[in-house]
């Protein structure tokens, strides 16, 4: 009875176990009882990242600058190219096939986490005592001005979008 299963890094062909090609190489010809599997290295623009019996290598991913993409890590014969987004943009998916501009945090919200090439801006509402009066992808909520430390008094209360307005203390006559 011929083998029905082969060992790790082998494959079954014509009732014969053959060695798979190592990462970075493609299959040229199957083994026979007394010849090895014949493999060839992938070309410069191609890769294979597993032990395989593929007759063609995969093309490296193209980081299209028209989609805001740039190369983060150049591909090798064993790894694909990794793309990331240009500054001010982030990936729309985990596979990073296109980019979109970072979100800005609206007035009343501040930046909790600045965006990266792979993640968008994370905003948070300004808590009591803090405000943001700008739409920004970088600015955190700022604390209200402390009138007391300037020997002033609050003339207008602050909100999550506006700072307090300080004014002079009323002098008793």
């Amino acid at each position: 009875e011929p083998p029905t299963a082969c060992r790790e890094k082998q494959y079954l062909i014509n009732s014969q176990c053959c060695s798979l090609c190592q990462p970075g190489q493609k299959l040229v010809s199957d083994c026979t009882e007394f010849t090895e599997t014949e493999c060839l290295p992938c070309s410069e623009s191609e890769f294979l990242d597993t032990w395989n019996r593929e007759t063609r290598c995969h093309q490296h991913k193209y980081c299209d600058p028209n989609l805001g993409l740039q190369v983060q890590q150049k591909g090798t014969s064993e790894t694909d190219t990794i793309c990331t987004c240009e500054e001010g943009l982030h990936c729309t998916s985990e596979s990073c096939e296109s980019c979109v501009p970072h979100r800005s945090c609206l007035p009343g919200f501040g930046v909790k986490q600045i965006a990266t090439g792979v993640s968008d801006t994370i905003c948070e509402p300004c808590p009591v005592g803090f405000f943001s009066n700008v739409s920004s992808a970088f600015e955190k909520c700022r604390p209200w001005t402390s009138c007391e430390t300037k020997d002033l008094v609050v003339q207008q209360a602050g909100t999550n979008k506006t700072d307090v307005v300080c004014g002079p203390q009323d002098r008793q006559r």
Epitope: C6, S15, Q16, C18, F34, T35
Partner: nanobody, 124 residues
Framework: QVQLVESGGGLVQPGGSLRLSCSAS????????MAWFRQAPGKERDFVAA????????YYADSVKGRFTISRDNSKNTLYLQMSSLRAEDTAVYYC?????????????????WGQGTQVTVSS
Amino acid sequence: QVQLVESGGGLVQPGGSLRLSCSASGRAFNTYTMAWFRQAPGKERDFVAAISRDGTITYYADSVKGRFTISRDNSKNTLYLQMSSLRAEDTAVYYCAARRVGAVPERESAYEHWGQGTQVTVSS
């Protein structure tokens, strides 16, 4: 899975003959490519001879060509090595090996199953 047990080794004079046997227990002996290897004291294990699953194709190391003959009897689950015109340099432990993966005959790492070996000593 196949288990291999060698026999037939011993002490023989230079120019003498010896026949080694390798008995395989387990199923499907005829699906294994078989070979003999040998290891002299203080040296690495070397390829001696190999035979195809159906017994029609044989390969030999240059050092034993014309002196040794490998054969198999699939009905008896047995591999043989007929050795003649023995020399002192043939002294070694002889191992029988089996594999299912396609490879050049002499690639030791391709063989998945090995016997414990039988000692052959050629001395006067």
